[in-house]
Amino acid sequence: TQNKALPENVKYGIVLDAGSSHTSLYIYKWPAEKENDTGVVHQVEECRVKGPGISKFVQKVNEIGIYLTDCMERAREVIPRSQHQETPVYLGATAGMRLLRMESEELADRVLDVVERSLSNYPFDFQGARIITGQEEGAYGWITINYLLGKFSQKTRWFSIVPYETNNQETFGALDLGGASTQVTFVPQNQTIESPDNALQFRLYGKDYNVYTHSFLCYGKDQALWQKLAKDIQVASNEILRDPCFHPGYKKVVNVSDLYKTPCTKRFEMTLPFQQFEIQGIGNYQQCHQSILELFNTSYCPYSQCAFNGIFLPPLQGDFGAFSAFYFVMKFLNLTSEKVSQEKVTEMMKKFCAQPWEEIKTSYAGVKEKYLSEYCFSGTYILSLLLQGYHFTADSWEHIHFIGKIQGSDAGWTLGYMLNLTNMIPAEQPLSTPLSHSTYV
């Protein structure tokens, strides 16, 4: 007789990543009877919400409901109706909302309140909206990539099931770059984590992990650019800012009020004799790199060694997955290949930044000018952050893997967040079952 497929016994989960520049909704799916196994959860959908990050709605909170509608309706379509009530929905807000909360806790709470009200109208099991800490963001990103790479599985394999697999149980470090913050997370080699704030202890699948993590608020690519502009305009002789981080021939008018809107530029704030200034690109990688380095204070370190701004950083250890904007920017610049050395990346950046703006616009006609104009800065910033900020070298550069997806799931903090909140990463190794339940009769 013909084998008949039984109804799929699966579960779903939804996580919204409310970042500083935009919100993305992720839908995850896993077999119900295997929730404690490692590597069984996978992403089935990503929906990018049209518009800016939720922190930008502070003066128009009544628009938040409409803003979230399309992606929530998409979730309603993707997940079978019979599963709606059992599907948890989590929203985690990151550095954009951390910055808003620094400015005004009341305004941040108002945004979160309206987000919660809006999301609760959908037929899912809404589990709340909150601002996650930088430490959580780093930790969950580390959990995500190691879960997807199979690093928590105790079974050693003679074959590779995922890219980047070094066929051992050494975990990967996680490098995450957002618009408003950046995180570095890894297991140091036999090194005491000198600063308690940067230490995490996990027991996952029967193994203990001592993890270092730090989140640098204001050092995401967008806020770093605001910082650089605020720093550089201080010494400008007039309302023209000749900027090496933008292509030759590029021009853009910036409002001083916009520049000083973010808490990230407070340290550079001064009274200027003009309300606006014009950025004029001169496209020089080396000068851009030098300007960016001035954002990193390396003169003070109360520990055996630091990243920058007096923040402890142990010696780098092992391979690293660099994701989010690290990946998006390097992918655009065609620099994600394992074969491209750090010297080659620097050479390519020099050439790219020197290209005239008109030429760039023609070559990348389909790309929005706002984003296109900032790739020279972003690429240079990534190099500066990794080399001077985190102390990667030309030799250790080959240990950085620019990762967008692993096994079809986006690298980022959202999967780790959901795995934790749904208790799907056990502290102890689950008892192995020799046979899984067959889905056929």
Epitope: I64, D109, R110, D113, V114, E116, R117, S120, G128
Partner: antibody, heavy 121, light 107 residues
Framework: QVQLVQSGAEVKKPGSSVKVSCKAS????????ISWVRQAPGQGLEWMGS????????NYAQKFQGRVTITADESTSTTYMELSSLRSEDTAVYYC??????????????WGQGTMVTVSS | EIVMTQSPATLSVSPGERATLSCRAS??????LAWYQQKPGQAPRLLIY???TRATGIPARFSGSGSGTEFTLTISSLQSEDFAVYYC?????????FGGGTKVEIK
């Protein structure tokens, strides 16, 4: 001191709709939420939905989605709760109550006197 | 949704005695929990919020404790005006949910 004053008792036929009002006096709505809670005879309290009058943002319990509409008129400091497709099980006292704070602070610190709605053919 | 369960359904206590009412949440609500008192024919009245903070004008004989999933309302010495129905309510997540109530009656 804010007081919430509700409209009078209503008797309705099954299938019809009822609209109950709740007027804030002795203060303004500000950005407080207003929740609607009902209580069937001899039963417990059941939350129906909420609105932030300042923004007109409403959210509802899944049980009442599509059948309840909560609106607000800031000019008169009045909130309304309309329940449609009435059935006998909707016979209850309907209360409006002020939520004392914002994000995750939805304790109900001021209550209206209640409006008895009877659904009978 | 978060399910709130109160026990006992009815509590018979003599005036002057202590009454202890329990409330359990189906998942952690932190300290986002309120207690209300309701007398026949009246609207509920807020007694306790934040699991343990007395609302304005509430006598000191009413106290709340607990966090996470287990909560207690204690009335240290029952007065005649305290015989009523008491409800707990979580306000961590939407929908707001109430316990089924505990009726405190005269023994």
């Amino acid at each position: 001191q804010v007081q919430l004053v509700q409209s009078g008792a209503e008797v309705k036929k099954p299938g019809s709709s009822v609209k109950v009002s709740c007027k804030a006096s002795g203060g303004t709505f500000e950005s407080y939420g207003i929740s609607w809670v009902r209580q069937a005879p001899g039963q417990g309290l059941e939350w129906m939905g909420s609105i932030i009058p300042e923004f007109g943002i409403a959210n509802y319990a899944q049980k009442f989605q599509g059948r309840v509409t909560i609106t607000a008129d800031e000019s008169t400091s009045t909130t309304y709760m309309e329940l449609s497709s009435l059935r006998s099980e909707d016979t209850a006292v309907y209360y409006c109550a002020r939520e004392s704070g914002g994000y995750r602070d939805h304790r109900l610190d001021v209550w209206g006197q209640g409006t008895m709605v009877t659904v009978s053919s | 949704e978060i399910v709130m369960t109160q026990s006992p359904a009815t509590l018979s206590v003599s005036p002057g005695e202590r009454a202890t009412l329990s409330c359990r949440a189906s998942q952690s609500v932190g300290s986002n929990l309120a207690w209300y008192q309701q007398k026949p024919g009246q609207a509920p009245r807020l007694l306790i919020y934040g699991a343990s903070t007395r609302a304005t004008g509430i006598p000191a004989r009413f106290s709340g404790s607990g966090s996470g999933t287990e909560f207690t309302l204690t009335i240290s010495s029952l007065q005649s005006e305290d015989f009523a129905v008491y409800y707990c309510q979580q306000y961590l997540l939407w929908p707001l949910t109430f316990g089924g109530g505990t009726k405190v009656e005269i023994k």
